[in-house]
Interface confidence: low
């Protein structure tokens, strides 16, 4: 007998063909011999089966000898062997209906687990294989689990259910709630305005929740809440903000914070958390601030950086148009009795300049001796 796989909630067409291409008597019955539908004269008649109100046939194809049965809004319990009786012959079709659903909401936070459950008819032994938008493959039987969702798992998952060499494909849309970047670093000269942006890696029609930015300054012994805010339908309203520094926050998404000026005492790292309404857990994004200061004091030209820098970063003092350079893999570099001219302080990573500050050194004239 022929095996047909169907999807819960979908429509399936079970075909039955007569050898003569003409309108003739036919019946569809279930395995208990209960009539579902058939033909009487040129009218479609329905039997006492509980499936009858969801069953139909393509009348336009009857005179071509095609007597298909269409079942709408498939249910797992529709799985059965269906018999088409036409021209004194019987054609059997085994219908197996499967359902694949996510155990929880399909909007999940990064790091949470996704469990997919397969509903299947008794006696079947299907296998399931799912492919994430990023190409990750998982397979299993009745349940499939993705223990820790990542940003790249957002999108349409394609799952193939196989049974008796037949397959049926399910599409499940998964939204991983996360920020676009796990971490970002802003490099600024002392006194410059600092912009922090936290774009989400998802779009939701309504976005409601509350958030907070905790800041650990390099110079401070403990972290401090810099700002708390509410999010109501994608509009941001500040609840509380520290007096020093006085952050400003944009009223629309993406979340946008402005620090009036970069100062060594603010250099450090922060953690922005966003708790969304009706979700357990929080979205996190780390943000780092590196501040540079170049100063000349008496005969000493110094360049310093504060904040989380990696040991492989190079700090250099360079005299413009001259070969004079002092470089160190350290947080401070200095030159004693620097030559006059425009000096550049550079923070670089493998030759790529991350931050640059210029300072002009004026020639020092010897003080005239008083007579």
């Amino acid at each position: 007998k022929k095996v047909v796989l169907g999807k819960k909630g979908d429509t399936v067409e079970l075909t039955c063909n007569a050898s003569q291409k003409k309108n003739t008597q036919f019946h569809w019955k279930n395995s208990n011999q209960i009539k579902i539908l058939g033909i009487q004269g040129s009218f479609l008649t329905k039997g006492p089966s509980k499936l009858s109100d969801r069953a139909d046939s393509r009348k336009s194809l009857w005179d071509q000898g095609c007597f298909s049965m269409i079942i709408k809004n498939l249910k797992i319990e529709d799985s059965d062997t269906y018999i088409c009786e036409v021209e004194n012959k019987k054609e059997e079709v085994e219908l197996l209906v499967f359902g694949l659903t996510a155990n929880s909401d399909t909007h999940l936070l990064e790091g949470q687990s996704l469990t997919l459950t397969l509903e299947s008819p008794p006696g079947s032994s299907p296998s399931v294989k799912c492919r994430s938008p990023g190409g990750k493959n998982i397979q299993g039987g009745r349940t499939l689990s993705v223990p820790q969702l990542e940003r790249q798992d957002s999108g349409t998952w394609t799952c193939t259910v196989s049974q008796d060499q037949k397959t049926v494909e399910f599409k499940i849309d998964i939204v991983v709630l996360a920020f676009q970047k796990a971490s970002s670093t802003v490099y600024k000269k002392e006194g410059e305005q600092v912009e922090f942006s936290f774009p989400p890696a998802f779009t939701l029609e309504k976005l409601t929740g509350s958030g907070e930015l905790w800041w650990q300054a390099e110079r401070a012994s403990s972290s401090k809440s810099w700002i708390t805010f509410d999010l109501k339908n994608k509009e941001v309203s500040v609840k509380r903000v520290t007096q020093d520094p006085k952050l400003q926050m944009g009223k629309k998404l993406p979340l946008h914070l402005t620090l009036p000026q970069a100062l060594p005492q603010y250099a450090g790292s922060g953690n922005l958390t966003l708790a969304l309404e009706a979700k357990t857990g929080k979205l996190h994004q780390e943000v780092n601030l590196v501040v540079m200061r170049a100063t000349q004091f008496q005969e000493n030209l110094t360049c310093e950086v504060w904040g989380p820098t990696s040991p492989k970063l190079t700090l250099s003092l360079k005299l413009e148009n001259k070969g004079t350079t002092v470089s160190k893999q350290a947080k401070a570099v200095w030159v004693l009795n620097p030559e006059a001219g425009m000096w550049q302080c550079l923070l670089s990573d493998s030759g790529q300049v991350l931050l640059e500050s210029n300072i002009k050194v004026v020639p020092t004239w010897p003080t005239p001796v008083q007579p």
């Epitope: 907070e212 905790w214 809440s225 109501k232 509009e235 309203s237 609840k239 509380r240 309404e277």
Partner: antibody
Framework: QVQLVQSGAEVKKPGASVKVSCKAS????????ISWVRQAPGQGLEWMGE????????YYNEKFKGRVTMTRDTSTSTVYMELSSLRSEDTAVYYC???????????WGQGTLVTVSS | DIVMTQSPDSLAVSLGERATINCKAS??????????MNWYQQKPGQPPKLLIY???NLESGVPDRFSGSGSGTDFTLTISSLQAEDVAVYYC?????????FGGGTKVEIK
């Protein structure tokens, strides 16, 4: 089910301090803000402040700043509210309440009566 | 702070009759299409109980004879058919701005 259980009634002298506890159960303690609301005898309701149990950060009504301190102990899922420099007008029932979305109070403790009398 | 003014202070209504309580905010409590107004019921010796949130949403488990309406600065709590168990003090509360503030309360009794 969500439960907030508060400590028993207290009688204090003017100038003293009182510390009221609120033990939470039936939900993830660190996930919801706990507010303190008081009600003087025969009077209305007054919000005193709130604490974020996850971070421990707390925010107070200007009226009580300098006199109120809210703390939490995550190991016991308990929030504390301490009010100092008590005066007779601080005689009230003090409630802890768990917020739902925003500052609407869905779950309440049974209340703690604090009497300030010389 | 937003000041909430309730009226009347007390109200006597016959069983099965309609009870209406008003609440006026000193400034609008609307934000992005929603009105951040909540209503509570308090019976003697008990903590308040949330009835209505965001002006008109019925809290789970609250009988549907309670309803809320209004926007901006003017809000109303209605009990369509007063029952004996509805005897209590009712408070309005705004949750738009810190600090959250409550109305002075309306005592509902049976006539």
């Amino acid at each position: 089910q969500v439960q907030l259980v508060q400590s028993g009634a207290e009688v204090k002298k003017p100038g003293a301090s009182v510390k009221v506890s609120c033990k939470a159960s039936g939900y993830t303690f660190t996930a919801y803000v706990i507010s303190w609301v008081r009600q003087a005898p025969g009077q209305g309701l007054e919000w005193m402040g709130e604490i974020y149990p996850g971070s421990g950060s707390s925010y107070y009504n200007e009226k009580f700043k300098g006199r109120v301190t809210m703390t939490r102990d995550t190991s016991t899922s308990t929030v504390y509210m301490e009010l100092s420099s008590l005066r007779s007008e601080d005689t009230a029932v003090y409630y802890c309440a768990r917020s739902g979305d925003g500052s609407r109070f869905v779950y309440w403790g049974q209340g703690t009566l604090v009497t300030v009398s010389s | 702070d937003i000041v909430m003014t309730q009226s009347p202070d007390s109200l006597a209504v016959s069983l099965g009759e309609r009870a209406t309580i008003n609440c006026k905010a000193s400034q609008s409590v609307d934000y992005d299409g929603d009105s951040y107004m909540n209503w509570y019921q308090q019976k003697p010796g008990q903590p308040p109980k949330l009835l209505i949130y965001v002006a008109s949403n019925l809290e789970s488990g609250v009988p549907d004879r309670f309803s809320g309406s209004g926007s901006g600065t003017d809000f109303t709590l209605t009990i369509s058919s007063l029952q004996a168990e509805d005897v209590a003090v009712y408070y309005c509360q705004q949750s738009l701005q810190d600090p959250p503030t409550f109305g002075g309360g309306t005592k509902v009794e049976i006539k």
